[in-house]
Amino acid sequence: HKSSSQGQDRHMIRMRQLIDIVDQLKNYVNDLVPEFLPAPEDVETNCEWSAFSCFQKAQLKSANTGNNERIINVSIKKLKRKPPSTNAGRRQKHRLTCPSCDSYEKKPPKEFLERFKSLLQKMIHQHLSSRTHGSEDS
């Protein structure tokens, strides 16, 4: 039970870290290539992980201007790191009925990042709701 709880905590930490990285990138939105990217919104239940992978696959890029290029590139790279898997995530990977990435509305980097953050927050909330007891921080 303890290792399962630690796994849950690791997952929660990773999702929370992704939000912090998104917030960091939002500070540099003017230094990103103003390209339109698929940005899932109002994702249907059980398609969260599919939408998450669309955000991770999107070609967010630094405009290579100014002093911020390194921090932007590191942040983008960290956003693409695979989070610890959960049972819900494993189950959703087998769903074939979720929309393809290309079918989602394309948005510029600012809105793309805002929608990514909203999805991450939704996933954290779902994750917490599925836990019946125990502290996230113990």
Epitope: D9, M12, R16, D20, Q121, I124, E136, D137, S138
Partner: antibody, heavy 117, light 106 residues
Amino acid sequence: QVQLVQSGAEVKKPGASVKVSCKASGYTFTDYWMHWVRQAPGQGLEWMGLIDTSDVYTIYNQKFKGRVTMTRDTSTSTVYMELSSLRSEDTAVYYCARYGPLAMDYWGQGTLVTVSS
Amino acid sequence: DIQMTQSPSSLSASVGDRVTITCRASQDISNYLNWYQQKPGKAPKLLIYYTSRLHSGVPSRFSGSGSGTDFTLTISSLQPEDFATYYCQQFHTLRTFGGGTKVEIK
């Protein structure tokens, strides 16, 4: 058990720099990011930033950008916070706090930094 | 930046009293709110995370509620060890603390 042990009190002159350390034990160091928070005498808590202990990625409070540098040494499970161009308003207790899943779950004992000419 | 405003800044109460502290965010932070307790000369300790969830080892007399911009920390029956300063903290966008509420003995 999780422990965060910080370095001792420091007295610095205005314009100088200070480097505070925070040694972690009781868990896998690189599994958890670390926050730094400060508290001026009789005042509230102020978030300074955080560091990814696995690869020194940092996110700083805009207020301290350009003056604060957070680093780490994985061989000793220690994180560092350096603040430069010190002024009297930087007199405060500086805390490290572990980045738990949704909160700062463990805190160091604090390091008092006094800036005085 | 998200500002957090706590009220009152201090209050006097007796052992056994029900105490309520409020925290208001300058914008919607959903449930992304934590509460910490700090005693003089000590580091803060986590009490409640994600608005209403009790951190391990925290007595059940502590509870949290709210959503959006308005949040409450309640101590149902104040104990001698509860006299301290309490801080709310948002983690919707990076981190910001409230100014603190000092709970003193009446």
